[in-house]
């Protein structure tokens, strides 16, 4: 469906508000260091240009592609070379290479200061003084820190952000109303960003076949009553949406996502009984609701899979005729029967089934060869079941902070070359799996835990790709998307690692420790723990626990002292000496 002017088409489809928001997100995700005002200026220029194209689609430049229009606009930024260095070289390229070049320069860990939350009264004043600017600033600040954030979903977050301020700035106790809502938006936003980053990594590093397989499994779990053809149509449409968003085509992505939501709501009867309440909502809320919708109930009369996929004499014939369709149907049938399995496990089973068919369909007696294929699934199923059960036991025994510490020690011993901030961030997030998943009933634990771990480990892979330091991490990240988590689980102590020399400065602390929030204190202590393990990778848990307990006692003592700085100066070296002796 071609249009004379793509920019006019998208402006009309999306409306001015969403158009401007999406262009701001796109520009902020590409030029992450540019000041807010610069982006607003660029967005306003693009918007004015779009309006001229709406008025006359034949006007000059209106026939240009969105990449050409947006790329040209980005390349007008005067400080491109000084601010972004070699990214400025992208501007010498023609489309589509120029856009690919911009995409490659997206920075998953931009050197930006952490967002500081002002006083509630200051925020409410800013909101009332200029609501539009206030909300644009939110889009800009989130987008530049999360360059793969799912753009239409970010508009939904911004709408919730606006609603929180509109409600709470009128409340008697503004802070009590607003702060929990902002905390929730922050935590949900970080989770949403990480989930989308995995989708983009899946598409960009492993191709759309990998993403489609993921989508078949997930949608079949969600919509077990839907026919395979229906699931396939949804998968095709969803793949297009995410391919566009991950490729920086945010206007097309948002437009196609709205079309997909419309289609799902018009075809509820053939998809799922759970869509009703989503479909009454306005667009942004509706799309979010559909994406998060709970699994429908499984049909009661599903037959055994063995008949079609093991016992049938036509297995090899059906496989040979259309391999991907046959495997897709197998994945669909398995997934709709197993909402209790993680998507990654389902994909491993499909991979194992494919490998068996590849081997057996070339054998003298194929049926005899693949007759026991379902038995071979058992160890693949037991591995994540055991992993989740053991980790939840450990979480329940230790509590979140100490569980994170256990993971910190384990991952530092596995990949000690990885930077300390990355190990702390990733291990803290791995540790959150306990609170998130262990309280759930047995049937929901594995999908919650393993699919969450996949998202967290993708963050490790993305950060490591930027600064590669470990062949083991590179191997686990690049060899197989579905086997990333088992690959990391199977890593053992790195015997080749040369312990880091002891640096007293790393273990020198000051009175500013006492004013930190509980979370910041934990991060400081966990940073010290990683450094300890890097220095003494063969230290036992008891030794490390002893040092950490002494550390907590030393900090607590000095934070209670009248002259805190003097206490840190005096007790610090004693703590360091005692720790070195304990680990000797």
């Amino acid at each position: 469906d071609t249009h004379k002017s793509e920019v006019a088409h998208r402006f009309k489809d999306l409306g001015e508000e969403h158009f401007k928001g999406l262009v701001l997100v796109a520009f902020s995700q590409y030029l992450q260091q540019c000041p807010f005002e610069e982006h607003v200026k660029l967005v306003n220029e693009v918007t004015e240009f779009a309006k001229t194209c709406v008025a006359d689609e034949s006007a000059e430049n209106c026939d240009k592609s969105l990449h050409t229009l947006f790329g040209d606009k980005l390349c007008t930024v005067a400080t491109l070379r000084e601010t972004y260095g070699e990214m400025a070289d992208c501007c010498a390229k023609q489309e589509p290479e120029r856009n690919e070049c911009f995409l490659q320069h997206k920075d998953d860990n931009p050197n930006l200061p952490p967002l500081v939350r002002p006083e509630v009264d200051v925020m409410c004043t800013a909101f009332h003084d200029n609501e539009a600017t206030f909300l644009k600033k939110y889009l800009y600040e989130v987008a530049r820190r999360h360059p793969y954030f799912y753009a239409p979903e970010l508009l939904f977050f911004a709408a919730r952000y606006k609603a929180a301020f509109a409600e709470c700035c009128q409340a008697a106790d503004k802070a009590a109303c607003l702060l929990p809502k902002l905390d929730e938006l922050r935590d949900e936003g970080k989770a949403s960003s990480a989930k989308q980053r995995l989708k983009c990594a899946s598409l960009q590093k492993f191709g759309d076949r990998a993403f489609k397989a993921w989508a078949v499994a997930r949608l079949s779990q969600k919509f077990p009553k839907a026919e395979f053809a229906e699931v396939s149509k949804l998968v095709t449409d969803l793949t297009k949406v995410h391919t566009e968003c991950c490729h920086g085509d945010l206007l097309e992505c948002a437009d196609d996502r709205a079309d997909l939501a419309k289609y799902m709501c018009e075809n509820q009867d053939s998809i799922s009984s759970k869509l009703k309440e989503c479909c009454d909502k306005p667009l942004l809320e509706k799309s979010h609701c559909l994406a998060e919708v709970e699994n429908d109930e499984m049909p009661a009369d599903l037959p055994s899979l063995a008949a079609d996929y093991v016992e049938s004499k036509d297995v090899c014939k059906n496989y040979a005729e259309a391999k991907d369709v046959f495997l897709g149907m197998f994945l669909y049938e398995y997934a709709r029967r197993h909402p209790d399995y993680s998507v990654m496990l389902l994909l491993r089973l499909a991979k194992a089934y494919e490998a068996t068919l590849e081997k057996c369909c070339a054998a003298a007696d194929p049926h005899e060869c693949y007759a026991k294929v379902f038995d071979e699934f058992q160890p693949l199923v037991e591995e994540p079941q055991n992993l989740v059960k053991q980790n939840c036991e450990l979480f329940e025994q230790l509590g979140e902070y100490k569980f994170q510490n256990a993971l910190l020690v384990r991952y530092t011993k596995k990949v000690p070359q990885v930077s300390t901030p990355t190990l702390v961030e990733v291990s803290r997030n791995l540790g959150k799996v306990g609170a998130k998943c262990c309280k759930l009933p047995e049937a929901k634990r594995m999908p919650c835990a393993e699919d969450y771990l996949s998202v967290v480990l993708n963050r490790l892979c993305v950060l490591h790709e930027k600064t590669p330091v470990s062949e083991k991490v590179t191997k686990c990240c690049t060899e197989s998307l579905v086997n990333r988590r088992p690959c990391f689980s199977a890593l053992e102590l790195d015997e080749a690692y040369v312990p880091k020399a002891f640096n007293a400065e790393t273990f020198t602390f000051h009175a500013d420790m006492c004013t930190l929030s509980e979370k910041e204190k934990q991060v400081k202590k966990q940073t010290a723990l990683v450094e300890l393990v890097k220095h003494k990778p063969k230290a036992t848990k008891e030794q490390l626990k002893g040092v950490m307990d002494n550390f907590a006692a030393f900090v607590e003592k000095c934070c209670k002292a009248d002259d805190k700085e003097a206490c840190f100066a005096e007790e610090g070296p004693k703590f360091v000496a005692a720790s070195q002796a304990a680990l000797a």
Epitope: A406, R410, K414, L493
Partner: nanobody
């Protein structure tokens, strides 16, 4: 320091049984996850089974499930491995391991190890 000593290994015919013991000294084992690993000649050390602090949870490698049983007696500071229906492929040196937080199959999760006891299953 926790010390572990395995015993009970030996030569047995396929289909036979053995019971391995792991006696701990130096510390009470009640705070430790206990496990058995094995290492066949020329192969990596592999997880066999583990038991949590209370004995309420046990885990087994797929290859030994239904044939081997792990148990612990915290009062005697000892862990046991009952091995039934032994197969030639079970031939290996069997190691007892202990850790505060040990997680199943990861060799690196365990801080304390015994010297091992040889189990040979003849066909």
């Amino acid at each position: 320091q926790l010390q572990l000593v395995e015993s009970g290994g030996g030569l047995v015919q396929a289909g036979g049984s053995l019971r391995l013991s792991c006696a701990a000294s130096g510390r009470a084992i009640s705070s430790y996850v206990m496990a058995w690993f094995r290492q066949a000649p020329g192969k990596e050390r592999e997880f066999v089974t583990s038991i949590n602090w209370s004995g309420g949870s046990t885990y087994y490698a797929h290859s030994v499930k239904g044939r081997f049983t792990i148990s612990r007696d915290n009062a005697k500071n000892t862990v046991y491995l009952q091995m039934n229906t032994l197969k030639p492929e079970d031939t290996a040196v069997y190691y007892c391991a202990a850790d505060l937080y040990g997680l199943g199959y990861e060799v690196m999760s365990y801080d304390y190890w015994g010297q091992g006891t040889q189990v040979t299953v003849s066909s």
